[in-house]
């Protein structure tokens, strides 16, 4: 009889320990949830306030219609320029029209003067076709003037009012482009 009572007592003790453990886990889980909730709320608040205060383009970017442009202050080869733009959530400049070309060249004149700036244009090694980096073809009026006699890969750049070509491994400034944020107001 005594042995039976002792066994029951031990079982109850074990049950109590398990319940305490469960309570501890639950408390820990609740605390973790509260922290996550706090973090999510802070993140949302941050996002909302930054969205509320945000202009269509980030600081130091220039806006024209639906696009934002960033004119680099460093030199790099074409491939590194491409990666530098991606880091900013953008791609190398893709010029869609003469109007866009005029805006870019006009802005460059104001900012920096006559330097070389990589854009997102490269020449296919096999076919010799010029393609923007998204795979589309430039409009006929926006083909680089033949200037590069390079055996290496050839890429496009802007200088003054012209679109020119050069060995992709030469160092130049570059221009990044991203879509402007649409105002929800």
């Amino acid at each position: 009889k005594l042995l039976q009572v002792s066994t029951i007592a031990m079982q109850q003790q074990e049950k109590l320990i398990q319940q305490e453990r469960a309570l501890l886990n639950f408390t820990e889980w609740k605390r973790s949830c509260a922290l996550q909730m706090k973090y999510c709320q802070a993140f949302m608040q941050n996002s909302l306030s930054s969205a509320h205060n945000s202009s269509p383009c980030p600081n130091n970017w220039i806006q024209n219609r639906e696009s934002c442009y960033y004119v680099s202050e460093i030199w790099s080869i074409w491939h590194t320029s491409q990666e530098n733009c991606l880091k900013e959530g953008s791609t190398l400049l893709q010029i869609e029209s003469k109007e866009e070309m005029d805006f870019i060249t006009g802005s460059l004149r104001k900012i920096k003067g006559s330097y070389d700036y990589w854009v997102g244009l490269s020449q296919d090694g096999h076919s010799g076709r010029w393609l923007w980096q998204d795979g589309s073809s430039p409009s006929p009026g926006l083909l680089p003037a033949e200037r590069s006699q390079s055996a290496n890969q050839v890429c496009g750049y802007v200088k003054s009012n012209s679109l020119l070509s050069s060995n992709c491994s030469t160092w130049k400034y570059f221009i990044c482009e991203k879509y402007a944020l649409r105002s929800s107001v």
């Epitope: 880091k87 900013e88 998204d134």
Partner: nanobody
Framework: QVQLQESGGGLVQPGGSLKLSCAAS????????MGWYRQAPGKQRELVAA???????TYADSAKNRFTISRENTRNTVHLQMSSLKAEDTAVYYC??????????WGQGTQVTVSS
């Protein structure tokens, strides 16, 4: 910390197709861009394709008109559909992500072998 998990690599015959996928997890709410690099034996790692958070695309010359990069609406998964595969496409393909704080993270890589 951000984790990237690639899948879909394997052995394929020349002219065949393959779809690579990459899922990002961990402390990630949004990103600046996601993409794919590849590294063939004895060569440097090179960018194959990337997609920005705004949906702008960029492809290496070798990938244009053969590969298509896309993103799932969850925005944390990126796919690379590869077609007309050639022996030169044989490489380890790495998924990458540029986060809002301009950090770049890498996946472990998935092997793609194009051979008959």
């Amino acid at each position: 910390q951000v984790q990237l998990q690639e899948s879909g690599g394997g052995l394929v015959q020349p002219g065949g197709s393959l779809k690579l996928s990459c899922a990002a997890s961990g402390s990630i709410f949004s990103f600046n861009a996601m993409g794919w690099y590849r590294q063939a034996p004895g060569k440097q790692r090179e960018l194959v394709a990337a997609i920005t958070d705004g949906g702008r695309l960029t492809y290496a010359d070798s990938a244009k008109n053969r590969f298509t990069i896309s993103r799932e609406n969850t925005r944390n998964t990126v796919h690379l559909q590869m077609s007309s595969l050639k022996a030169e496409d044989t490489a380890v393909y790495y998924c990458t992500i540029w986060t809002k704080d301009r950090q770049q993270y890498w996946g472990q890589g998935t092997q793609v072998t194009v051979s008959s």
